[in-house]
């Protein structure tokens, strides 16, 4: 179980690196973030570490109310601050693992 979660964490972070460069990866991460109401791996601040992402931006899928451009110059109160690894991990533990 721990190994699966560790792999999921590493994979999620890897996909974040590819987010600005790969539309397919972006759509998968967007779906996960929107469905699980989460943002980033550990939390939303993970997005500022992605070199090709502007530091005042998170994907629109992080927004509580998703609209085009809502992640640009974001305010913390308008986005999901919890990380996806913990949120999705909890769901996996309960439903799959």
């Amino acid at each position: 179980r721990d190994k699966v979660m560790s792999e999921f964490n590493n994979n999620f972070r890897q996909q974040m690196e590819n987010y600005p460069k790969n539309n397919h990866t972006a759509s998968i991460l967007d779906r996960m973030q929107a469905d699980f109401k989460c943002c980033g791996a550990a939390n939303y601040t993970d997005w500022e570490k992605i070199p090709s992402m502007s530091k005042n931006r998170v994907p629109d899928s992080c927004c509580i109310n998703v609209t085009v451009g809502c992640g640009i110059n974001f305010n913390e109160k308008a986005i999901h601050k919890e990380g996806c690894v913990e949120k999705i991990g909890g769901w996996l533990r309960k439903n799959v693992l």
């Epitope: 939390n43 601040t45 500022e48 502007s54 530091k55 005042n56 931006r57 451009g69 809502c70 640009i72 110059n73 974001f74 305010n75 913390e76 109160k77 308008a78 601050k81």
Partner: antibody
């Protein structure tokens, strides 16, 4: 009504330190990012630093990075700027500024506090 | 970093004139452009946000337009209290938050 009141400015020698404070009232402090913006005598506006609602994110202008530190106390509705290794070119009026972010501009500014660095 | 360039840097006009100030960004900033007014010895005041939205309490003679890299602030009929310095500012890609160098509007 919404108020931002800066304090802590004054005359300091080069290499010295100063701590600016900004007391806020009339709004929910944690709903906003906060900025420090300065203006040297006769010059334009220069962004210094900003901090996110919770304090998780903090950024600085290249000109002050490593010398200045921004912080906030959400329990006291206050913003701070710790300034060290001060130089003559840090002489300016320092404004505390509220920022709702997203498409909105910086909508409320304090009256400013003057910092003079001179020997 | 995104550079903001205002023109002109100073401008003389008379009460009742229509005045236009321009601001150009070094790269596209969509509509993430704000305009501020500053009077001597006072703090700046937000006039226009999102390129064309009038901030609450600002007179309707002020208007903004543009998107991408080119923006304008227009004062349709100058009033005595409008003589001040005007700054544009981008919030599309930060840090840093960047301002134009300012346009000083003087009485002719």
């Amino acid at each position: 009504q919404v108020q931002l009141v800066e304090s802590g400015g004054g005359l300091v020698k080069p290499g010295g330190s100063l701590r600016l404070s900004c007391a806020t009232s009339g709004f929910t402090f944690t709903d906003y990012f906060m900025n420090w913006i300065r203006q040297a005598p006769g010059k334009g506006l220069e962004w210094v630093s900003y901090i996110s609602n919770s304090g998780s994110i903090r950024y600085y202008a290249d000109s002050v990075r490593g010398r200045f530190s921004i912080s906030r106390d959400n329990a006291k509705n206050s913003l701070y700027l710790q300034m060290s290794s001060l130089r003559a070119d840090d002489t300016a009026v320092y404004y505390c500024v509220r920022d709702p972010r997203q498409i909105y501009g910086m909508d409320v500014w304090g009256q400013g506090t003057t910092v003079t660095v001179s020997s | 970093d995104i550079q903001m360039t205002q023109s002109p840097s100073s401008l003389s006009a008379s009460v009742g004139d229509r005045v236009t100030i321009t601001c150009r960004a070094s790269q596209s900033i969509s509509s993430y452009l704000n305009w501020y007014q500053q009077k001597p010895g006072k703090a700046p005041k937000l006039l226009i946000y999102a390129a064309s939205s009038l901030q609450s309490g600002v007179p309707s003679r002020f208007s903004g337009s543009g998107s991408g890299t080119d923006f304008t602030l227009t004062i349709s009929s100058l009033q005595p209290e409008d003589f001040a310095t005007y700054y544009c500012q981008q919030s599309y890609s930060t840090p840093p938050i960047t301002f134009g160098q300012g346009t000083r509007l003087e009485i002719k």
